[in-house]
């Protein structure tokens, strides 16, 4: 089945942008001016997920790259990674659960909860230039709130 998708950038609640850090990692840092062009453009897709009150299941791919954010266990810990996929088959309505995030939107702030690991969220550190990761705490030191802006083609 066809999938609704959009192109966007994400910034954490401290206005840090997300950029590539090597081939399979994202990091968060403050960007200004022309450096804003470095920020990653996501292709966010509306996918199938478990029934819930007001969580919206999405997949987060990197625009025009065959990479998707996914959640897997590494050394017994839920971990965020960029995973390569076959572009002929993605995005699709029924994404594997490791690719699915529950988008939670409150007062124009977005959280992305792992569908595979409930209560684990896409997170950034307070510190500059640190990797984007999957965090198991909300409301602590680490940042789990993001804003989204459409990207004009």
């Amino acid at each position: 089945a066809p999938v609704r998708s959009l192109n966007c950038t994400l910034r954490d609640s401290q206005q840090k942008s997300l950029v590539m850090s090597g081939p399979y990692e994202l990091k968060a840092l403050h960007l200004q001016g022309q450096d804003m062009e470095q920020q990653v453009v996501f292709s966010m897709s509306f996918v199938q997920g478990e029934e819930s009150n007001d969580k919206i299941p999405v997949a987060l791919g990197l625009k025009e790259k065959n990479l998707y954010l996914s959640c897997v266990l590494k050394d017994d810990k839920p971990t965020l990674q960029l995973e390569s996929v076959d572009p002929k088959n993605y995005p699709k309505k029924k994404m594997e659960k490791r690719f699915v995030f529950n988008k939670i939107e409150i007062n124009n702030k977005l959280e992305f909860e792992s569908a595979q690991f409930p209560n684990w969220y896409i997170s950034t550190s307070q510190a500059e230039n640190m990797p984007v990761f999957l965090g198991g705490t909300k409301g602590g030191q680490d940042i789990t709130d993001f804003t989204m802006q459409f990207v004009s083609s």
Epitope: V3, L6, F46, D54, M148, F150, V151, S152
Partner: antibody
Framework: EVQLVESGGGLVQPGGSLRLSCTVS????????MSWVRQAPGKGLEWIGI???????YYASWAKGRFTISKDTSKNTLYLQMNSLRAEDTAVYFC?????????????WGQGTTVTVSS | EIVMTQSPSTLSASVGDRVIITCRAS??????LSWYQQKPGKAPKLLIY???NLASGVPSRFSGSGSGAEFTLTISSLQPEDFATYYC??????????FGQGTKLTV
Amino acid sequence: EVQLVESGGGLVQPGGSLRLSCTVSGFSLSSYAMSWVRQAPGKGLEWIGIIYDSASTYYASWAKGRFTISKDTSKNTLYLQMNSLRAEDTAVYFCARERQIFSGDMDGWGQGTTVTVSS
Amino acid sequence: EIVMTQSPSTLSASVGDRVIITCRASQSIGNWLSWYQQKPGKAPKLLIYRASNLASGVPSRFSGSGSGAEFTLTISSLQPEDFATYYCQNTGGGINIAFGQGTKLTV
């Protein structure tokens, strides 16, 4: 306060074209999706299509080809270009804001603009 | 394409009545269903989203229930301002966002 105001409706001949506008305030088109919905006289609501970013637009199957949704974020304005108009396109046209990204439901509506297709 | 069918098409009721409107989807849509109220010459107003969540500012006499392919909108005690047309809407059906044909609630 969220406000949506449609304009551009009027009388057009069959086969003609018309561009409707929807100017919004109280929120930004750079972070909300927008739909167009129409209602023929005495009939129900009919979804036309939705726009996210400028490259991501989706249409009802019947609207593909004749109807085009676009927007100018800097002007806070949404557009509906309608071509090859027919008598059955006579309706009130509403713009509406999607409550949340991909939620599908619409929590803000304009007052509507009337399009009459007649010779 | 998923088709949404409302019943009844018209419904007569009195102030104080409990009213139930039904919406059926031609296939399962989970809880991706919304309800709207529309008064003559006005824009629709969102009442319920995700089948059972009350939209902001909507009186608590309105409630929604259901999942899968069958849904209901209930008005517990009809008020004079509730006479209007009600529409259900499939909000999660892939590309298409389809409305039911409407239920007109009259005195």
